[in-house]
Protein backbone atom coordinates (compact mmCIF):
# COMPACT_ATOMS: atom_id res chain seq x y z
CA UNK A 1 0.00 0.00 0.00
CA UNK A 2 1.43 3.35 -0.97
CA UNK A 3 1.62 6.26 1.43
CA UNK A 4 3.75 9.33 1.82
CA UNK A 5 7.17 7.78 2.43
CA UNK A 6 8.84 10.82 3.96
CA UNK A 7 6.61 11.24 7.02
CA UNK A 8 4.52 8.08 6.67
CA UNK A 9 1.00 9.43 6.50
CA UNK A 10 -2.00 8.55 4.36
CA UNK A 11 -2.81 11.43 1.98
CA UNK A 12 -6.32 10.19 1.25
CA UNK A 13 -7.38 9.26 4.79
CA UNK A 14 -6.45 11.06 7.95
CA UNK A 15 -8.35 8.52 10.05
CA UNK A 16 -5.48 6.06 9.90
CA UNK A 17 -2.47 4.99 11.91
CA UNK A 18 0.64 4.66 9.78
CA UNK A 19 4.01 3.10 10.47
CA UNK A 20 6.99 1.92 8.38
CA UNK A 21 6.23 -1.75 9.03
CA UNK A 22 5.26 -2.73 5.50
CA UNK A 23 7.43 -4.89 3.22
CA UNK A 24 10.94 -3.46 3.03
CA UNK A 25 10.14 -0.90 5.72
CA UNK A 26 7.54 0.77 3.53
CA UNK A 27 4.90 2.93 5.11
CA UNK A 28 1.71 1.04 5.83
CA UNK A 29 -1.51 2.63 7.04
CA UNK A 30 -4.36 1.00 8.87
CA UNK A 31 -7.84 2.40 9.34
CA UNK A 32 -8.80 3.39 12.85
CA UNK A 33 -11.48 1.19 14.38
CA UNK A 34 -10.95 -1.78 12.09
CA UNK A 35 -7.17 -2.03 11.73
CA UNK A 36 -7.65 -2.88 8.04
CA UNK A 37 -4.72 -1.91 5.80
CA UNK A 38 -5.80 0.79 3.35
CA UNK A 39 -4.53 1.82 -0.06
CA UNK A 40 -3.50 5.46 0.34
CA UNK A 41 -3.32 6.06 -3.39
CA UNK A 42 -7.12 6.02 -3.62
CA UNK A 43 -10.20 6.71 -1.50
CA UNK A 44 -10.88 4.52 1.51
CA UNK A 45 -14.24 2.75 1.50
CA UNK A 46 -17.13 4.46 3.26
CA UNK A 47 -17.65 1.46 5.53
CA UNK A 48 -14.13 1.68 6.93
CA UNK A 49 -14.43 5.46 7.25
CA UNK A 50 -17.68 5.20 9.19
CA UNK A 51 -16.14 2.58 11.45
CA UNK A 52 -13.13 4.83 12.03
CA UNK A 53 -15.43 7.77 12.74
CA UNK A 54 -17.34 5.79 15.34
CA UNK A 55 -14.11 4.72 17.01
CA UNK A 56 -12.79 8.29 17.23
CA UNK A 57 -13.60 10.51 20.21
CA UNK A 58 -17.04 12.10 19.81
CA UNK A 59 -17.14 15.67 18.40
CA UNK A 60 -38.80 25.29 -16.06
CA UNK A 61 -37.60 22.46 -14.15
CA UNK A 62 -34.16 21.35 -15.02
CA UNK A 63 -33.64 19.83 -11.59
CA UNK A 64 -34.11 16.12 -11.00
CA UNK A 65 -37.11 14.93 -9.01
CA UNK A 66 -35.75 12.11 -6.85
CA UNK A 67 -37.50 8.88 -7.62
CA UNK A 68 -39.84 7.32 -5.07
CA UNK A 69 -37.30 4.61 -4.30
CA UNK A 70 -34.52 7.09 -3.55
CA UNK A 71 -33.06 6.55 -0.13
CA UNK A 72 -32.01 9.36 2.17
CA UNK A 73 -29.84 8.58 5.18
CA UNK A 74 -32.20 9.48 8.01
CA UNK A 75 -30.66 7.02 10.44
CA UNK A 76 -27.39 8.89 10.75
CA UNK A 77 -24.19 7.39 12.11
CA UNK A 78 -23.76 3.82 13.23
CA UNK A 79 -20.83 1.47 13.76
CA UNK A 80 -20.98 -0.75 10.67
CA UNK A 81 -19.79 -4.26 9.97
CA UNK A 82 -17.46 -4.31 6.99
CA UNK A 83 -16.30 -7.29 4.98
CA UNK A 84 -12.57 -8.01 4.43
CA UNK A 85 -12.56 -5.75 1.35
CA UNK A 86 -13.99 -2.89 3.37
CA UNK A 87 -17.49 -3.12 1.87
CA UNK A 88 -20.62 -2.95 3.99
CA UNK A 89 -22.01 -6.31 5.01
CA UNK A 90 -25.56 -6.66 3.71
CA UNK A 91 -26.93 -7.10 7.22
CA UNK A 92 -26.14 -4.66 9.99
CA UNK A 93 -27.13 -5.08 13.63
CA UNK A 94 -26.76 -2.91 16.69
CA UNK A 95 -25.82 -3.92 20.23
CA UNK A 96 -29.46 -4.60 21.09
CA UNK A 97 -29.82 -7.21 18.32
CA UNK A 98 -31.88 -4.96 16.10
CA UNK A 99 -30.94 -5.73 12.49
CA UNK A 100 -31.59 -4.24 9.05
CA UNK A 101 -30.36 -4.60 5.48
CA UNK A 102 -28.23 -1.93 3.83
CA UNK A 103 -27.16 -1.06 0.31
CA UNK A 104 -23.59 -0.62 -0.92
CA UNK A 105 -23.38 2.85 0.62
CA UNK A 106 -24.49 1.57 4.01
CA UNK A 107 -27.95 3.12 3.98
CA UNK A 108 -30.82 1.12 5.46
CA UNK A 109 -33.13 -0.30 2.77
CA UNK A 110 -35.51 -2.43 4.84
CA UNK A 111 -37.52 -2.10 8.01
CA UNK A 112 -35.65 -2.98 11.15
CA UNK A 113 -36.01 -6.52 12.43
CA UNK A 114 -34.37 -8.97 14.81
CA UNK A 115 -31.49 -11.42 14.43
CA UNK A 116 -33.65 -13.63 12.23
CA UNK A 117 -33.71 -10.96 9.50
CA UNK A 118 -32.09 -12.18 6.28
CA UNK A 119 -30.28 -9.97 3.80
CA UNK A 120 -29.44 -12.22 0.87
CA UNK A 121 -27.11 -9.88 -0.99
CA UNK A 122 -25.53 -6.47 -0.82
CA UNK A 123 -27.65 -4.42 -3.20
CA UNK A 124 -25.67 -1.93 -5.23
CA UNK A 125 -26.45 1.78 -5.16
CA UNK A 126 -26.03 2.64 -8.84
CA UNK A 127 -27.34 6.23 -8.90
CA UNK A 128 -26.54 8.99 -6.41
CA UNK A 129 -28.11 12.43 -6.59
CA UNK A 130 -26.24 15.08 -4.62
CA UNK A 131 -28.50 18.07 -4.07
CA UNK A 132 -26.78 21.26 -2.89
CA UNK A 133 -27.93 24.76 -2.18
CA UNK A 134 -25.19 27.35 -2.50
CA UNK A 135 -24.88 30.52 -0.53
CA UNK A 136 -25.73 33.76 -2.39
CA UNK A 137 -22.68 34.99 -4.27
CA UNK A 138 -21.56 38.41 -5.45
CA UNK A 139 -21.08 36.99 -8.95
CA UNK A 140 -23.42 34.56 -10.71
CA UNK A 141 -22.25 31.10 -11.70
CA UNK A 142 -22.34 30.14 -15.35
CA UNK A 143 -23.84 26.66 -15.72
CA UNK A 144 -21.19 25.31 -18.10
CA UNK A 145 -18.36 26.67 -15.93
CA UNK A 146 -19.94 25.15 -12.84
CA UNK A 147 -20.39 21.83 -14.65
CA UNK A 148 -16.74 21.79 -15.73
CA UNK A 149 -15.46 22.70 -12.27
CA UNK A 150 -17.50 20.01 -10.50
CA UNK A 151 -16.41 17.39 -13.01
CA UNK A 152 -12.80 18.47 -12.51
CA UNK A 153 -13.26 18.21 -8.74
CA UNK A 154 -14.59 14.65 -8.87
CA UNK A 155 -11.87 13.64 -11.32
CA UNK A 156 -8.91 15.25 -9.56
CA UNK A 157 -9.79 15.27 -5.87
CA UNK A 158 -11.86 12.10 -5.61
CA UNK A 159 -10.25 10.23 -8.52
CA UNK A 160 -13.64 9.32 -9.91
CA UNK A 161 -13.63 8.45 -13.61
CA UNK A 162 -15.44 11.22 -15.55
CA UNK A 163 -17.84 8.75 -17.14
CA UNK A 164 -19.45 8.22 -13.72
CA UNK A 165 -20.46 11.88 -13.38
CA UNK A 166 -23.67 11.60 -15.38
CA UNK A 167 -24.88 15.19 -15.15
CA UNK A 168 -24.64 18.49 -13.33
CA UNK A 169 -27.87 20.48 -13.10
CA UNK A 170 -28.11 24.09 -11.97
CA UNK A 171 -31.11 26.16 -11.10
CA UNK A 172 -29.85 28.91 -8.82
CA UNK A 173 -29.26 28.38 -5.95
CA UNK A 174 -29.67 24.62 -6.34
CA UNK A 175 -26.95 22.43 -7.80
CA UNK A 176 -27.49 18.74 -8.46
CA UNK A 177 -24.72 16.29 -9.24
CA UNK A 178 -25.74 12.91 -10.60
CA UNK A 179 -23.38 10.01 -10.21
CA UNK A 180 -24.15 6.73 -11.98
CA UNK A 181 -22.21 3.49 -11.80
CA UNK A 182 -23.72 0.09 -12.52
CA UNK A 183 -22.04 -3.08 -11.31
CA UNK A 184 -21.09 -3.94 -14.89
CA UNK A 185 -19.46 -0.52 -15.43
CA UNK A 186 -17.22 -0.59 -12.39
CA UNK A 187 -13.82 -1.99 -13.26
CA UNK A 188 -11.12 -3.06 -10.83
CA UNK A 189 -9.43 0.01 -9.42
CA UNK A 190 -12.35 2.33 -10.18
CA UNK A 191 -13.40 4.56 -7.28
CA UNK A 192 -16.91 3.71 -6.15
CA UNK A 193 -19.47 6.50 -6.55
CA UNK A 194 -20.59 5.90 -2.95
CA UNK A 195 -17.09 6.55 -1.66
CA UNK A 196 -16.66 9.64 -3.83
CA UNK A 197 -20.02 10.98 -2.65
CA UNK A 198 -19.08 10.39 0.98
CA UNK A 199 -15.75 12.22 0.63
CA UNK A 200 -17.57 15.08 -1.09
CA UNK A 201 -20.23 15.16 1.62
CA UNK A 202 -17.59 15.40 4.33
CA UNK A 203 -15.75 18.10 2.35
CA UNK A 204 -18.81 20.31 2.05
CA UNK A 205 -19.44 19.93 5.77
CA UNK A 206 -15.94 21.22 6.46
CA UNK A 207 -14.83 17.78 7.66
CA UNK A 208 -12.27 16.85 5.02
CA UNK A 209 -10.99 13.30 5.18
CA UNK A 210 -7.80 14.14 3.32
CA UNK A 211 -4.60 14.33 5.32
CA UNK A 212 -3.22 17.77 6.06
CA UNK A 213 -5.26 19.66 3.49
CA UNK A 214 -7.26 22.72 4.40
CA UNK A 215 -10.95 22.77 3.65
CA UNK A 216 -12.16 22.33 0.10
CA UNK A 217 -11.85 25.59 -1.85
CA UNK A 218 -14.18 25.29 -4.82
CA UNK A 219 -14.15 28.18 -7.31
CA UNK A 220 -15.97 28.83 -10.52
CA UNK A 221 -13.99 31.36 -12.56
CA UNK A 222 -12.49 32.59 -9.33
CA UNK A 223 -15.83 33.01 -7.55
CA UNK A 224 -15.96 30.83 -4.42
CA UNK A 225 -18.85 28.41 -4.10
CA UNK A 226 -20.12 28.00 -0.56
CA UNK A 227 -22.59 25.29 0.32
CA UNK A 228 -25.49 26.04 2.66
CA UNK A 229 -27.11 22.63 2.72
CA UNK A 230 -26.66 19.19 1.24
CA UNK A 231 -29.10 16.36 0.60
CA UNK A 232 -27.95 13.09 -0.90
CA UNK A 233 -30.37 10.63 -2.50
CA UNK A 234 -29.36 7.03 -3.16
CA UNK A 235 -31.01 4.79 -5.74
CA UNK A 236 -30.42 1.07 -5.66
CA UNK A 237 -30.37 -1.46 -8.50
CA UNK A 238 -33.20 -3.26 -6.68
CA UNK A 239 -35.85 -1.04 -5.04
CA UNK A 240 -35.84 -1.08 -1.24
CA UNK A 241 -38.32 -3.05 0.82
CA UNK A 242 -40.15 -0.94 3.38
CA UNK A 243 -43.56 -1.52 4.87
CA UNK A 244 -46.43 0.65 3.60
CA UNK A 245 -46.52 2.37 6.99
CA UNK A 246 -43.11 3.91 6.35
CA UNK A 247 -43.88 4.86 2.76
CA UNK A 248 -46.97 6.83 3.77
CA UNK A 249 -45.48 8.26 6.90
CA UNK A 250 -44.47 11.62 5.41
CA UNK A 251 -41.24 13.00 4.06
CA UNK A 252 -38.02 13.77 5.82
CA UNK A 253 -36.66 17.15 6.83
CA UNK A 254 -33.58 18.50 5.11
CA UNK A 255 -31.67 20.86 7.34
CA UNK A 256 -28.24 22.24 6.75
CA UNK A 257 -25.88 19.51 5.63
CA UNK A 258 -28.16 16.60 6.52
CA UNK A 259 -28.07 13.93 3.91
CA UNK A 260 -31.33 12.14 4.32
CA UNK A 261 -31.41 8.75 2.77
CA UNK A 262 -34.89 8.51 1.38
CA UNK A 263 -36.60 6.43 -1.15
CA UNK A 264 -38.42 8.43 -3.81
CA UNK A 265 -39.13 7.27 -7.44
CA UNK A 266 -38.90 8.23 -11.18
Amino acid sequence: HTAAQDNCTCPTNKMTVCSPDGPGGRCQCRALGSGVAVDCSTLTSKCLLLKARMSAPKNARTLVRPNEHALVDNDGLYDPDCDPEGRFKARQCNQTSVCWCVNSVGVRRTDKGDLSLRCDELVRTHHILIDLRHRPTAGAFNHSDLDAELRRLFRERYRLHPKFVAAVHYEQPTIQIELRQNTSQKAAGDVDIGDAAYYFERDVKGESLFQGRGGLDLRVRGEPLQVERTLIYYLDEIPPKFSMKRLTGGGSGGGSHHHHHHHHHH
Epitope: P136, A138, K205, G206, G214, R219, R221, G222
Partner: antibody
Framework: QVQLVQSGAEVKKPGASVKVSCKAS????????INWVRQRPGQGLEWMGW????????KYAQKFQGRVTMTVDTSTSTVYMELSSLRSEDTAVYYC???????????????WGQGTLVTVSS | EIVLTQSPATLSLSPGERATLSCSAS?????IYWYQRKPGQAPRLLIY???NLASGIPARFSGSGSGTDFTLTISSLEPEDFAVYYC?????????FGQGTKVEIK
Protein backbone atom coordinates in the same frame (compact mmCIF):
# COMPACT_ATOMS: atom_id res chain seq x y z
CA GLN B 1 3.17 32.73 7.80
CA VAL B 2 1.06 34.23 5.04
CA GLN B 3 2.57 37.50 3.90
CA LEU B 4 1.97 40.05 1.15
CA VAL B 5 4.77 42.50 0.35
CA GLN B 6 4.08 45.45 -1.91
CA SER B 7 6.35 47.63 -4.03
CA GLY B 8 7.45 51.07 -2.88
CA ALA B 9 5.84 54.50 -3.11
CA GLU B 10 5.37 56.12 -6.52
CA VAL B 11 4.96 59.70 -7.71
CA LYS B 12 3.24 60.07 -11.07
CA LYS B 13 2.06 62.85 -13.33
CA PRO B 14 -1.59 63.14 -14.39
CA GLY B 15 -2.32 60.99 -17.44
CA ALA B 16 0.46 58.53 -16.63
CA SER B 17 0.11 54.92 -15.46
CA VAL B 18 1.32 53.23 -12.31
CA LYS B 19 2.01 49.52 -11.74
CA VAL B 20 2.04 48.26 -8.17
CA SER B 21 3.28 44.78 -7.30
CA CYS B 22 2.22 42.45 -4.50
CA LYS B 23 4.40 39.41 -3.74
CA ALA B 24 2.80 36.58 -1.80
CA SER B 25 4.50 34.01 0.40
CA UNK B 26 3.66 31.46 3.07
CA UNK B 27 0.79 29.74 1.27
CA UNK B 28 -0.15 28.09 -2.01
CA UNK B 29 -0.30 31.18 -4.19
CA UNK B 30 -2.87 29.83 -6.63
CA UNK B 31 -5.35 28.86 -3.91
CA UNK B 32 -6.87 32.25 -3.12
CA UNK B 33 -7.74 35.47 -4.87
CA ILE B 34 -5.85 38.74 -4.44
CA ASN B 35 -7.97 41.84 -4.03
CA TRP B 36 -6.96 45.47 -4.43
CA VAL B 37 -8.39 48.12 -2.14
CA ARG B 38 -7.41 51.77 -1.98
CA GLN B 39 -7.78 54.49 0.60
CA ARG B 40 -7.69 58.11 -0.46
CA PRO B 41 -6.59 60.75 2.06
CA GLY B 42 -9.33 61.27 4.65
CA GLN B 43 -11.62 58.78 2.89
CA GLY B 44 -12.82 55.25 3.50
CA LEU B 45 -11.77 51.98 1.88
CA GLU B 46 -12.63 51.43 -1.78
CA TRP B 47 -12.55 48.02 -3.46
CA MET B 48 -11.03 47.94 -6.95
CA GLY B 49 -11.21 44.28 -7.95
CA TRP B 50 -9.65 40.86 -7.60
CA UNK B 51 -7.64 38.36 -9.60
CA UNK B 52 -7.55 34.60 -9.05
CA UNK B 53 -4.03 33.30 -9.79
CA UNK B 54 -5.04 29.70 -10.52
CA UNK B 55 -6.80 30.53 -13.77
CA UNK B 56 -6.32 34.28 -14.15
CA UNK B 57 -10.01 35.03 -13.58
CA UNK B 58 -10.63 38.62 -12.53
CA LYS B 59 -13.40 40.90 -11.42
CA TYR B 60 -13.11 44.69 -11.53
CA ALA B 61 -15.29 47.31 -9.89
CA GLN B 62 -17.31 49.11 -12.57
CA LYS B 63 -15.78 52.40 -11.45
CA PHE B 64 -12.29 51.26 -12.52
CA GLN B 65 -13.27 49.23 -15.57
CA GLY B 66 -11.14 50.26 -18.53
CA ARG B 67 -8.51 51.91 -16.34
CA VAL B 68 -7.36 49.05 -14.15
CA THR B 69 -5.53 45.90 -15.22
CA MET B 70 -4.63 43.11 -12.83
CA THR B 71 -2.10 40.50 -13.88
CA VAL B 72 -0.35 37.59 -12.24
CA ASP B 73 3.07 35.98 -12.49
CA THR B 74 2.76 32.55 -10.90
CA SER B 75 6.50 31.86 -11.27
CA THR B 76 7.24 34.60 -8.71
CA SER B 77 3.92 34.48 -6.81
CA THR B 78 3.36 38.11 -7.68
CA VAL B 79 0.24 40.02 -8.62
CA TYR B 80 0.33 43.40 -10.36
CA MET B 81 -2.24 46.17 -10.42
CA GLU B 82 -1.85 48.79 -13.14
CA LEU B 83 -3.95 51.94 -13.09
CA SER B 84 -3.85 54.16 -16.16
CA SER B 85 -4.93 57.69 -17.04
CA LEU B 86 -4.07 58.83 -13.54
CA ARG B 87 -5.66 61.94 -12.09
CA SER B 88 -5.08 63.77 -8.83
CA GLU B 89 -8.00 62.00 -7.16
CA ASP B 90 -6.16 58.68 -7.64
CA THR B 91 -3.71 59.79 -4.97
CA ALA B 92 -4.17 57.08 -2.36
CA VAL B 93 -2.63 54.20 -0.48
CA TYR B 94 -3.19 51.04 -2.53
CA TYR B 95 -3.44 47.73 -0.68
CA CYS B 96 -3.45 44.16 -1.86
CA UNK B 97 -5.20 41.61 0.34
CA UNK B 98 -5.80 37.91 -0.07
CA UNK B 99 -9.15 36.23 0.44
CA UNK B 100 -9.21 32.60 1.48
CA UNK B 101 -12.45 30.67 1.09
CA UNK B 102 -13.74 27.15 1.43
CA UNK B 103 -17.07 25.56 0.61
CA UNK B 104 -18.00 26.33 4.22
CA UNK B 105 -16.86 29.94 4.68
CA UNK B 106 -15.57 33.09 3.05
CA UNK B 107 -12.74 34.15 5.35
CA UNK B 108 -12.63 37.81 4.32
CA UNK B 109 -9.59 39.87 3.35
CA UNK B 110 -6.71 38.61 5.45
CA UNK B 111 -3.86 39.42 5.47
CA TRP B 112 -3.21 42.73 3.76
CA GLY B 113 -0.03 44.08 2.20
CA GLN B 114 1.65 47.03 3.89
CA GLY B 115 0.23 49.45 1.33
CA THR B 116 1.78 51.49 -1.49
CA LEU B 117 1.37 55.26 -1.55
CA VAL B 118 0.73 56.55 -5.07
CA THR B 119 0.87 60.32 -5.41
CA VAL B 120 -0.47 61.90 -8.58
CA SER B 121 0.77 65.45 -8.98
CA SER B 122 1.80 67.74 -11.78
CA GLU C 1 -24.46 49.12 -5.18
CA ILE C 2 -25.01 48.22 -1.53
CA VAL C 3 -24.30 51.18 0.74
CA LEU C 4 -23.07 50.39 4.25
CA THR C 5 -23.69 53.09 6.84
CA GLN C 6 -21.77 52.90 10.09
CA SER C 7 -22.81 54.55 13.29
CA PRO C 8 -21.74 56.39 15.23
CA ALA C 9 -19.02 58.11 13.22
CA THR C 10 -17.02 58.52 16.43
CA LEU C 11 -17.31 56.66 19.71
CA SER C 12 -15.57 58.18 22.75
CA LEU C 13 -15.04 55.61 25.47
CA SER C 14 -12.65 54.72 28.26
CA PRO C 15 -10.58 51.53 28.56
CA GLY C 16 -12.66 48.76 30.13
CA GLU C 17 -15.92 50.04 28.69
CA ARG C 18 -18.10 48.16 26.22
CA ALA C 19 -18.16 49.38 22.62
CA THR C 20 -21.08 48.73 20.29
CA LEU C 21 -20.59 49.63 16.63
CA SER C 22 -23.40 49.43 14.08
CA CYS C 23 -23.40 48.76 10.37
CA SER C 24 -26.58 49.20 8.36
CA ALA C 25 -26.92 47.93 4.76
CA SER C 26 -29.07 49.63 2.13
CA UNK C 27 -30.37 46.21 1.12
CA UNK C 28 -30.27 42.79 2.76
CA UNK C 29 -26.90 41.04 2.90
CA UNK C 30 -26.04 37.55 4.08
CA UNK C 31 -22.76 38.20 5.82
CA ILE C 32 -20.69 41.11 7.08
CA TYR C 33 -16.93 41.36 7.63
CA TRP C 34 -15.28 43.70 10.14
CA TYR C 35 -11.79 45.23 9.95
CA GLN C 36 -9.69 47.33 12.29
CA ARG C 37 -7.33 49.99 11.00
CA LYS C 38 -4.73 51.86 13.03
CA PRO C 39 -2.83 54.92 11.74
CA GLY C 40 0.02 53.97 9.44
CA GLN C 41 -1.01 50.30 9.38
CA ALA C 42 -2.89 48.10 6.96
CA PRO C 43 -6.40 47.01 7.93
CA ARG C 44 -6.74 43.80 9.92
CA LEU C 45 -9.60 41.33 9.67
CA LEU C 46 -11.51 40.86 12.93
CA ILE C 47 -14.74 39.06 12.05
CA TYR C 48 -15.74 36.99 9.02
CA UNK C 49 -19.15 35.64 8.05
CA UNK C 50 -20.85 38.04 10.50
CA UNK C 51 -19.94 36.29 13.72
CA ASN C 52 -16.76 34.24 13.32
CA LEU C 53 -13.60 35.46 14.99
CA ALA C 54 -10.61 35.69 12.64
CA SER C 55 -7.41 33.90 13.59
CA GLY C 56 -5.50 35.56 16.43
CA ILE C 57 -8.28 38.00 17.34
CA PRO C 58 -9.10 38.25 21.06
CA ALA C 59 -12.44 36.92 22.27
CA ARG C 60 -13.53 40.35 23.50
CA PHE C 61 -14.48 41.05 19.87
CA SER C 62 -17.77 39.62 18.65
CA GLY C 63 -20.09 40.12 15.70
CA SER C 64 -23.80 39.62 15.23
CA GLY C 65 -26.75 40.64 13.09
CA SER C 66 -28.63 39.66 9.96
CA GLY C 67 -30.43 41.18 7.01
CA THR C 68 -29.61 44.88 7.06
CA ASP C 69 -28.44 45.43 10.63
CA PHE C 70 -25.12 44.22 11.99
CA THR C 71 -23.12 44.89 15.14
CA LEU C 72 -19.51 44.66 16.24
CA THR C 73 -19.10 44.51 20.01
CA ILE C 74 -15.92 44.96 22.01
CA SER C 75 -16.83 43.70 25.47
CA SER C 76 -14.11 45.54 27.38
CA LEU C 77 -11.89 48.02 25.56
CA GLU C 78 -8.16 47.57 25.80
CA PRO C 79 -5.77 50.46 25.03
CA GLU C 80 -4.80 48.84 21.71
CA ASP C 81 -8.45 48.75 20.55
CA PHE C 82 -8.67 52.47 19.89
CA ALA C 83 -8.74 52.58 16.10
CA VAL C 84 -11.06 52.92 13.11
CA TYR C 85 -13.41 50.02 12.37
CA TYR C 86 -14.90 49.20 8.98
CA CYS C 87 -17.66 46.81 7.95
CA UNK C 88 -17.71 45.23 4.48
CA UNK C 89 -20.16 43.20 2.41
CA UNK C 90 -19.49 40.43 -0.08
CA UNK C 91 -23.07 40.01 -1.23
CA UNK C 92 -22.89 41.84 -4.54
CA UNK C 93 -20.43 43.71 -6.69
CA UNK C 94 -18.91 46.13 -6.18
CA UNK C 95 -17.76 45.00 -2.75
CA UNK C 96 -18.34 47.94 -0.45
CA PHE C 97 -17.09 49.15 2.91
CA GLY C 98 -18.76 51.35 5.48
CA GLN C 99 -17.26 54.80 6.00
CA GLY C 100 -15.79 53.70 9.34
CA THR C 101 -16.34 54.26 13.04
CA LYS C 102 -13.52 55.81 15.00
CA VAL C 103 -13.21 54.53 18.56
CA GLU C 104 -11.27 57.12 20.53
CA ILE C 105 -10.18 57.47 24.13
CA LYS C 106 -12.55 59.59 26.17
Amino acid sequence: QVQLVQSGAEVKKPGASVKVSCKASGYTFTSSDINWVRQRPGQGLEWMGWIYPRDGSKKYAQKFQGRVTMTVDTSTSTVYMELSSLRSEDTAVYYCATRFATVVSNYGLDPWGQGTLVTVSS
Amino acid sequence: EIVLTQSPATLSLSPGERATLSCSASSSVNYIYWYQRKPGQAPRLLIYDTSNLASGIPARFSGSGSGTDFTLTISSLEPEDFAVYYCQQWNSYPLTFGQGTKVEIK
